[in-house]
Interface confidence: medium
């Protein structure tokens, strides 16, 4: 396209998750306090009132944010949202502090942690879910960093996060069954799903997996599992723990 | 959703519509029975109250979406460090109250998982029910459009959003316009497929009108969301 | 082909309940709803609901709630339409048809072969 | 509830001539690029057959003499030329939103 006039990336011009990164790029903002709303009657297509999160505009090269909503007559300043419902937007005062870290936004629904986090199997105490996994022991037992399960790449990758060598592995196929995809999946937050676990031969070019020691007796997966320079199956864990992706036209073709 | 056309039955399963009161308000993803994907921006206060939404799967047309075929929000969960100025980290889950049953009308779309490659120029699908065109009003039927990823580098340039564009955000669509999502389809989502398999690749989240040159689509990074969405999905089991 | 074979005529008496099937063939049963449409004796068209096999969701007229209930078998692809309290109003013609419920564009591609209800003590 | 509003509420035509059925919603029954008026034939004793959908839509296997037009709240049938096959009832239906509702019919019959 002749519109691509700026020069090539210095590194592969490519979107990609690094695994468990932070978030949030940027050191977090102050939290703002929403303005006030009142609402009215809904209309059923009312003029798009309020865009109260708003949308940012750009003048040449001085990129302005637009804090005010898109009224009827409307800046350019919005978020893609149809806020149909007529919710005018009133006075409001601006309050500005770290009183709400960004932190209490969502609550979490634990055991015994129900406000405040995730329990630590090994002594009851509660850990914030961002420190889960994320190289880095909180639990006295380190169980927040043995209980890391993860899908790689479009192939469903089964990999396990191995504190010790604080990277991620994938599992071995050899004394693989379903009951331990099952095990995976619940770990990974599918509640009730489990889809298929099979082999398939690994191209990523893995020199470390993670194997099952079926000696271990009737323990934890994660009790199970060792490090391994080999697989003698040479294939590793594809794991699907929900049919996800698939639409009636790609269902259509593949019949 | 501009320049697009309107969707078949199954076309797009995961894609729900979100009302409040009755009325199409954003779009969303469903990811399993009870989670749906969607943008932060749609569920800014007062909509962060679980009580005010109602999700519709399977049905094409608003005029359909009658009381009894929604589902309740049990639970809404907004990204903690989402910024409702830079549209920074806008990503929500929605927890419905009673799992959807999966049919063919309503399936869930893949979560991306890390590892996986997007070309500069990947081809991606938007929908939603989101106007047909700038200051227009919400769609009666679900749209889809084709458009193409756009390098942050590219979008972050002076003549497109001149470093607006965060690692937590993704832009797509055309540099000369004409096709885009709109207002009403923010929470929608972006997809691709891949080994014929679709991935969630973004949540429609805001830009500079609908559909003009040099002001394409930007859409939450939904890659650098997942093991955030695992962990909400986790905790609350 | 595309068909909707619904059950034979029926002479029920007031107050009595019945049931009426509509057994879809040719096609794929969880892709369409099934909707229910009464025609009394020289009249029109009266549209009851709805229901999608898909997922068991349903939909009716106001006019109908309480009179119709609308359930599917799907390992037999039928629909069935519950008529009960019946009067000598529920006298009718009782067709099941086939709209695409996704869409929901909302019109009758395919129709069954009709039902005969006659309520007489 | 939309209303709809048919006429006449029969007609007779010669063969080969043309037919026009009119309806009328009581609020437009078009949205988003698409009029939700759709017609159906019925003969007696016979289910209902669908003619046309979103207004002007033939639907396969009906004859082309068979057209529709409208859009908003006014729609018409034309059937050009009459077949004696055609003798029938015609019932418009709109599926602008819920309940759906049918015209009252008009009849066909021939000269």
């Known amino acids: 396209m002749a519109l691509n006039s700026g020069s090539p990336p210095a590194i592969g011009p490519y979107y990609e998750n690094h695994g468990y990164q932070p978030e949030n790029p940027y050191p977090a903002q102050p939290t703002v306090v929403p303005t006030v709303y009142e609402v009215h009657p809904a209309q059923y297509y009312p003029s798009p009132v309020p865009q109260y999160a708003p949308r940012v505009l750009t003048q040449a090269s001085n990129p302005v944010v637009c804090t005010q909503p898109k009224s009827p007559s409307g800046t350019v300043c919005t978020s893609k949202t149809k806020k149909a419902l007529c919710i005018t937007l009133t006075l409001g005062t601006f309050l500005v502090g770290a009183a709400l870290a960004a932190g209490l936004l969502w609550k979490f629904m634990g055991s015994k942690c129900s406000n405040s986090g995730i329990e630590c199997d090994s002594s009851g105490t509660c850990i914030n879910p961002s420190n889960w996994c994320d190289g880095v022991s909180h639990c006295p037992g380190g169980e927040d960093e043995n209980r890391c399960v993860r899908l790689y790449g479009p192939n469903f990758i089964l990999q396990v996060y191995s504190s010790q060598r604080k990277s991620w592995h994938p599992v071995c196929q050899d004394d693989w069954n379903e009951n331990y995809g099952r095990a995976a999946c619940r770990d990974m937050g599918y509640k009730n799903n489990f889809y298929s676990s099979q082999g398939i031969v690994d191209d990523s070019g893995s020199t470390s997996f993670m194997k099952l020691n079926t000696s271990a007796g009737n323990v934890d997966i994660y009790k199970k599992l060792y490090h391994s320079d080999a697989c003698s199956s040479k294939a590793v864990v594809s794991l699907r723990c929900i049919a996800c992706g698939v639409n009636l036209n790609s269902s259509r073709q593949s019949r | 959703i501009v320049g697009g056309e309107s969707a078949l039955p199954g076309a797009w399963p995961w894609q729900v519509s979100l009302h409040v009161q009755n009325v199409h308000v954003c779009g969303g993803s469903i990811i399993t029975p009870e989670w749906i994907v969607t943008a932060a921006h749609c569920v800014e206060k007062p909509l962060n109250n679980p009580a005010h939404w109602t999700a519709f799967a399977g049905i094409l047309r608003q005029s359909f979406m009658f009381y009894g075929a929604g589902y309740q929000v049990e639970k809404v969960i907004s990204h903690p460090n989402y910024d409702s100025k830079t549209k920074n980290n806008d990503i929500a889950l929605m927890k419905l109250q009673k799992p959807l049953t999966f049919n063919d009308l309503v399936k869930p779309v893949c979560l991306p998982n890390p590892g996986m490659m997007l070309q500069p120029e990947q081809l991606c699908w938007i929908s939603g029910w989101g106007a047909t065109e700038e200051k227009g009003k919400t769609s009666e039927v679900l749209n889809a459009a084709k458009v193409l990823l756009i390098e942050t580098q590219r979008c972050n340039s002076r003549y497109v959003y001149d470093n607006l564009i965060t690692p937590a955000m993704i832009c797509a669509g055309f540099l000369q316009g004409n096709v885009d999502s709109c207002q009403g389809d923010s929470g929608g989502p972006l997809v691709t497929s891949k080994n014929n398999i679709w991935w969630l690749i973004g949540d429609t989240s805001w830009g500079s009108g609908c559909a003009k040159a040099y002001r394409p689509g930007v859409y939450g990074n939904v890659m650098v969301f997942t093991d955030w969405i695992y962990r909400q999905m986790r905790a609350d089991g | 082909q595309v068909q909707l074979q619904q059950s034979g005529p029926a002479l029920v008496k007031p107050g009595a309940s019945l049931k009426i099937s509509c057994e879809a063939s040719?096609?794929?049963?969880?892709?369409?709803?099934i909707n229910w449409v009464k025609q009394r004796p020289g009249q029109g068209l009266e549209w009851i609901g709805w229901i999608f096999p898909g997922s068991g969701s349903t939909y009716y007229n106001e006019k109908f709630k309480g009179k119709a209930t609308l359930t599917i078998d799907k390992s037999s692809s039928t629909a069935y339409m519950l008529l009960s309290s019946l009067t000598s109003e529920d006298s009718a013609v009782y067709f099941c048809?086939?709209?695409?419920?996704?869409?929901?564009?909302?019109?009758?591609?395919?129709w069954g072969t009709g039902t005969t209800v006659t309520v007489s003590s | 509830d939309i209303v709809l509003t048919q006429s006449p509420a029969s007609l007779a035509v010669s063969l080969g001539q043309r037919a026009t059925i009119s309806c009328r919603a009581s609020?437009?029954?078009?949205?988003?690029?698409?009029?939700?008026m759709h017609w159906y034939q019925q003969k007696p004793g016979q289910p209902p057959k669908l003619l046309i959908y979103l207004a002007s839509n033939l639907e396969s296997g009906v004859p082309a003499r068979f057209s529709g037009s409208g859009s908003g709240t006014d729609f018409t049938l034309n059937i050009h030329p009459v077949e004696e096959e055609d003798a029938a009832t015609y019932y418009c239906?709109?599926?602008?939103?819920?309940?759906?509702?049918f015209g009252a019919g008009t009849k066909l019959e021939l000269k």
């Open positions: 609020k437009s029954v078009s949205t988003s690029g698409y009029s939700y």
């Open positions: 239906q709109h599926s602008r939103d819920l309940p759906l509702t």
């Open positions: 040719g096609y794929t049963f969880t892709y369409y709803s």
């Open positions: 048809a086939r709209s695409d419920y996704g869409s929901a564009y909302g019109y009758f591609d395919v």
